[in-house]
Structure formats: structure tokens, C-alpha cells
């Protein structure tokens, strides 16, 4: 059994304008250092599953085991925290599922369920069969450890019965939990034996104990809440994109770069070109050309469309993404075949060329200018 469990966002937030590049918030898994993590890729009918962490390919090693749709990390450390993705490659398409792993000393897990089942938790016992409090639905209490992203709603439940009907009170870290202990207070739904805290913040972290009692006895149950904090991060590119492509002379082709980013990213499509018959400048750095970049009024920069291609269009195309926080890049190759040859589907792989990570770039003029790889500067 995994030592953590996914927490779903149950808050209802006002509708916001769609964000062009943001993939929906990934699910959060939390584990304590030293524990073993096991995650199942929630994608169906996968022929091949590949894994990435923070956009970088994840392969097996002495602590990472990849078996079928399962990823297992032995002896987790805080360095294992990050944005993970599993990509299922099928015969006709591929799909990616994202999730966050947070390895923290404040271990937590669990999920918030809606009160759809409502009042069946409220057990009313008639007659003279006096009875001390007892739990009526222990399944809803199994997840003692709850990891919740900041600003979400948390619900703890202690469904109980007894005769007379027991009362319920809540403690935080062993002391009476008062409304004034948190901004916005909290709600207690006695009918549902639940405690609800909206818009949780880091100061809400701690142990929450429900005490259920009547004159014949008392029972209690403790939950641990960890509030997972979010900060903006550099862009992360979906593994496998852009994908290698091939087409015939005169054909059309599209490269797609899918970005996960909190902060809105700038996207640049860059191609290796020749200048005076050479692909490299005197300093050994490649000549590059910015084909397209995102700007305030640009069209969908995630897609680079090439129409009526010629043999000169063949080569490597780089998707370089940067936001206020940092950068990421991946590339793909275009093969242009003579017209009489029918193109075959290229194997979809993604290269992250080392020189993009190591070199400086320069781009300080128009979009179509060729520049030597020294510094790329943003000009909107």
C-alpha cells in the first residue's frame, strides 16, 4: 500500500479566464523521509510508460524501481520532491499524467470526500439500550494523514453512534480548538460528525483530535494535517514534445511544445541555420534563428506550423521556454523527404541538447535575423 495518498481540491473558486499554457493542477502526494513511495500511473491501455521528474527522464537506479505502471522510490528524501509525469505511449497517440511528490518531515496523506452520503453517519438509537460511543464508519477515518495544498478546504470526519447520542468536540494539538484560533474560524457539522476548515494556511498544520463522548464513555481519533505550500516554479515541458516529424517537400508540419508553468511562460522556437555556408561561428557556437516567440499579441506560441516545406527546412527545432523564474528547452528533428518518397512516422523522442543548457545566446534584433549562439534577449 502506498505510504501516501492523493488529496483532491474540494474548494469552489470563481471562474477565471483560461490560461493558455497551464495544465490543471497536479495531484499531490506526500511522504516522510525514509519511506518508500509507490505511485501507479493513472493512464489506461499503455503500451509503453515513460517517467519524468521536473521534465527530466527518470530511469531505474538503486532507489528507483519502474515496473509496469508503477513507480517505486525506496528511502525517499526531500530531493525526490518535484513534479512527476508518466507518459503512456500507445500505437496511435500518447497521454501524460502529472502529479506532485512532496517529501517532508510533516508527513501527511488522505483525501477529502464530499458529504454525499450525508446523514447515514448520524445514528440515532432509540429505546433503553444504553451504549458508549462507537465509530460507525471507520473507513472514512482510515486516512489519518492529510496533505492539502494551501488555500484548499479540509474536512475531518468522525462518524459515531451511541446512546444517548454522543457529543463531539475538537482539539488542535491536544488543546481545545477555538474559533479564534484561525482566521475565518471553522465549521462543525454535528449531523455529519465533521470539522471543516476553509482556505487552509501553513499555521493550520498540526494534529486535530475529535473527542466523542456521552455519559457511558469517550472515544477519540486524531488526524494530522500538513499544508503543502506552493511557489512559482520554472517551466516544465511535457516529455516527448516536440516530437520528431517527417514530411515530403511541399508538405506541412506542426511541432507542439506543451508547457506546465505557474507563471506564464515566454516560448521561443529556434532553428539551427547556416550562415555563409557554415553552421557554426568562429567561436564554435551554432548559428540560430528565432522563428516564432510568444508576446502580448502573438498567436498560440505552443505550436510551430511550417507550410510548404523545402529541404532547407530540415533540421533541429528547439522549443525554448522561459518565465520570470527560469527556463527549459527541448527539441525535435524535421526530416524532409523528396516528393516521391512517402513519409513514415518518426519515433517520437525528445532531445535536450547540452549546448542549450551550457551556452549563451544572443538575439537582439528582428525575429528573422540569424544570430550567433551567445545571448537571447527578449524583445516584445
Amino acid at each position: 500500500r502506498p505510504s501516501f495518498s492523493l488529496v483532491e481540491d474540494t474548494t469552489l473558486e470563481p471562474e477565471e479566464p483560461p490560461t493558455k499554457y497551464q495544465i490543471s493542477q497536479p495531484e499531490v502526494y506526500v511522504a516522510a523521509p525514509g519511506e518508500s513511495l509507490e505511485v501507479r500511473c493513472l493512464l489506461k491501455d499503455a503500451a509503453v510508460i515513460s517517467w519524468t521528474k521536473d521534465g527530466v527522464h527518470l530511469g531505474p537506479n538503486n532507489r528507483t524501481v519502474l515496473i509496469g505502471e508503477y513507480l517505486q522510490i525506496k528511502g525517499a528524501t526531500p530531493r525526490d520532491s518535484g513534479l512527476y509525469a508518466c507518459t503512456a505511449t500507445r500505437t496511435v497517440d500518447s497521454e501524460t499524467w502529472y502529479f506532485m511528490v512532496n517529501v517532508t518531515d510533516a508527513i501527511s496523506s488522505g483525501d477529502d470526500e464530499d458529504d454525499t452520503d450525508g446523514a447515514e453517519d448520524f445514528v440515532s438509537e432509540n429505546g433503553n439500550n444504553k451504549r458508549a460511543p462507537y465509530w460507525t464508519n471507520t473507513e472514512k477515518m482510515e486516512k489519518r494523514l492529510h496533505a492539502v495544498p494551501a488555500a484548499n478546504t479540509v474536512k475531518f470526519r468522525c462518524p459515531a453512534g451511541g446512546n444517548p447520542t454522543p457529543t463531539m468536540r475538537w482539539l488542535k494539538n491536544g488543546k481545545e480548538f477555538k474559533q479564534e484560533h484561525r482566521i475565518g474560524g471553522y465549521k462543525v457539522r454535528n449531523q455529519h460528525w465533521s470539522l471543516i476548515m476553509e482556505s487552509v494556511v501553513p499555521s493550520d498544520k498540526g494534529n486535530y483530535t475529535c473527542v466523542v463522548e456521552n455519559e457511558y464513555g469517550s472515544i477519540n481519533h486524531t488526524y494530522h494535517l500538513d499544508v503543502v505550500e506552493r511557489s512559482p516554479h520554472r517551466p516544465i515541458l511535457q516529455a516527448g514534445l516536440p516530437a520528431n516529424a517527417s514530411t515530403v517537400v511541399g508538405g506541412d508540419v506542426e511541432f507542439v511544445c506543451k508547457v506546465y508553468s505557474d507563471a506564464q511562460p515566454h516560448i521561443q522556437w529556434i532553428k539551427h541555420v547556416e550562415k555563409n555556408g557554415s553552421k557554426y561561428g568562429p567561436d564554435g557556437l551554432p548559428y540560430l534563428k528565432v522563428l516564432k516567440h510568444s508576446g502580448i499579441n502573438s498567436s498560440n506560441a505552443e505550436v510551430l506550423a511550417l507550410f510548404n516545406v523545402t529541404e532547407a527546412d530540415a533540421g533541429e527545432y528547439i522549443c525554448k521556454v522561459s518565465n520570470y523564474i527560469g527556463q527549459a528547452n527541448q527539441s525535435a528533428w524535421l526530416t524532409v523527404l523528396p516528393k516521391q518518397q512517402a513519409p513514415g512516422r518518426e519515433k517520437e523522442i525528445t532531445a535536450s541538447p547540452d549546448y542549450l543548457e551550457k551556452l549563451e545566446f544572443r538575439h537582439d534584433s528582428g525575429l528573422n535575423d540569424i544570430f550567433e549562439a551567445q545571448k537571447i534577449e527578449w524583445h516584445e
Epitope: 507563471a263 506564464q264 545571448k375 516584445e380
Partner: antibody, heavy 113, light 108 residues
Framework: QVQLVQSGAEVKKPGESLKISCKGS????????IHWVRQMPGKGLEWMGA????????TYSPSFQGQVTISADKSISTAYLQWSSLKASDTAMYYC??????WGQGTLVTVSS | DIQMTQSPSSLSASVGDRVTITCRAS???????SNWYQQKPGKAPKLLIY???NLQSGVPSRFSGSGSGTDFTLTISSLQPEDFATYYC?????????FGQGTKVEIK
């Protein structure tokens, strides 16, 4: 913990050169832009430029282009802001910031004859 | 360059008050990239809100951000003694990443 530590206050004369530093620790230095921000006495914040230490990608505000140079040495997780010839109007507090969330304590530069 | 104009430039308020600061961009900031910072005298700025509406880790939930296009708002739902400071907006849509001129929140 994640932090940026800046070099100490400097008192210089007009025409002199200066290089101030910003050392990152507690995180992967190469994975985040380092931004430089100026705050003149009693005034607001002005974005000067940024560098991505992994590949030394730099960008400058037009107001500061040619006036300062931003550089980084990723081997020692340090970013720099330098002037070749200081002016009295360069007197200000200079902050470095990792992205938007982590800021250095600031370096006060005083240029006076 | 995109200019960011904050209003008011200063305001006086009491503990418990609801405070709203607005920032207007000189052109549409599509897609709504703005940060809000708090700065106290002699201290470095502190990030409160990123990308218009995301609360930064560790920032109290009384702070909230909203807006799109050209108009952005920072709201403090119930002003606390430690909130008296200067607040800045910043656009991070296109270079140069300009700041607003600041709004000083003082005790009434």
C-alpha cells in the same frame, strides 16, 4: 534554507568601478533567474535586468542597458552586478532576487566625491 | 515599455479595515502576469501574490489578488498592525519587468 546573501555596503567616488555580488544557497542556483532591482533613496523599485546562471542568458531594462553588466559564476552560485564608471546618480540600494520569491538583503552603494 | 500606475499613492487606514490597492497597466497584460510585494522600511520586498491571484507560500490568507487585462487589485480583507508598509505591483509579461510606483499604507 533558501537564501541570497549580498555583499556589503560600498562607498565609492564618481568614475570608479564596482562589482557587487549575490550568493545563492539552499537551492539549485542554475535553475532560477537572478533579477537585479534598484531602489534609490526614498523612491520605488526599478527592475534592472536578469541573468539565468545555467547558460548566462541575460536581459536588461533599456534604462540600464550599457550602464551596468550582469554576470554569474555558477560554479560558486554567485551573480554579479558591475559598473565600469560610477556616477553620483548610482547611489541606491541594490537588491538581487531569485525569481520573485527570494530576495537578498540588499547592498547599499553610495557614490560621492 | 508597459507602465504600471498604482493608486492611491498613499492611504490611511485602521486595524480591521478592508484595504484595496489598484494597479493599472498601460496596455493589456495578456495573460495577466502581475506580482504584488510588501516592503517595510529598511527591508527587502516580500512577495505576496504572484501571477495576479496566487497567494505566495506563507502569506496570510487576508491578502488576495485579482484582475485581468489592464486592471489589477490587491485586497487586504482585515488590516493587521504588521500590514502597515509600502506595496508594489509588478508586471512580468514582457521586458522590462516594470513596477508600480508604490502605495504607502499608514495608520489612521
Amino acid at each position: 534554507q533558501v537564501q541570497l546573501v549580498q555583499s556589503g555596503a560600498e562607498v565609492k567616488k564618481p568614475g570608479e568601478s564596482l562589482k557587487i555580488s549575490c550568493k545563492g544557497s539552499g537551492y539549485s542556483f542554475t535553475n532560477y533567474y537572478i533579477h537585479w532591482v534598484r531602489q534609490m533613496p526614498g523612491k520605488g523599485l526599478e527592475w534592472m535586468g536578469a541573468i539565468y546562471p545555467d547558460n548566462s542568458d541575460t536581459t536588461y531594462s533599456p534604462s540600464f542597458q550599457g550602464q551596468v553588466t550582469i554576470s554569474a559564476d555558477k560554479s560558486i552560485s554567485t551573480a554579479y552586478l558591475q559598473w565600469s564608471s560610477l556616477k553620483a546618480s548610482d547611489t541606491a540600494m541594490y537588491y538581487c532576487a531569485r525569481g520573485a520569491d527570494i530576495w537578498g538583503q540588499g547592498t547599499l552603494v553610495t557614490v560621492s566625491s | 515599455d508597459i507602465q504600471m500606475t498604482q493608486s492611491p499613492s498613499s492611504l490611511s487606514a485602521s486595524v480591521g479595515d478592508r484595504v484595496t490597492i489598484t494597479c493599472r497597466a498601460s496596455q493589456d497584460i495578456d495573460p495577466y502576469l502581475s506580482n504584488w510585494y510588501q516592503q517595510k522600511p529598511g527591508k527587502a520586498p516580500k512577495l505576496l501574490i504572484y501571477d495576479a491571484s496566487n497567494l505566495q507560500s506563507g502569506v496570510p490568507s487576508r491578502f488576495s489578488g485579482s484582475g485581468s487585462g489592464t486592471d489589477f487589485t490587491l485586497t487586504i480583507s482585515s488590516l493587521q498592525p504588521e500590514d502597515f508598509a509600502t506595496y508594489y505591483c509588478q508586471q512580468t509579461t514582457s521586458h522590462p519587468y516594470t513596477f508600480g510606483q508604490g502605495t504607502k499604507v499608514e495608520i489612521k
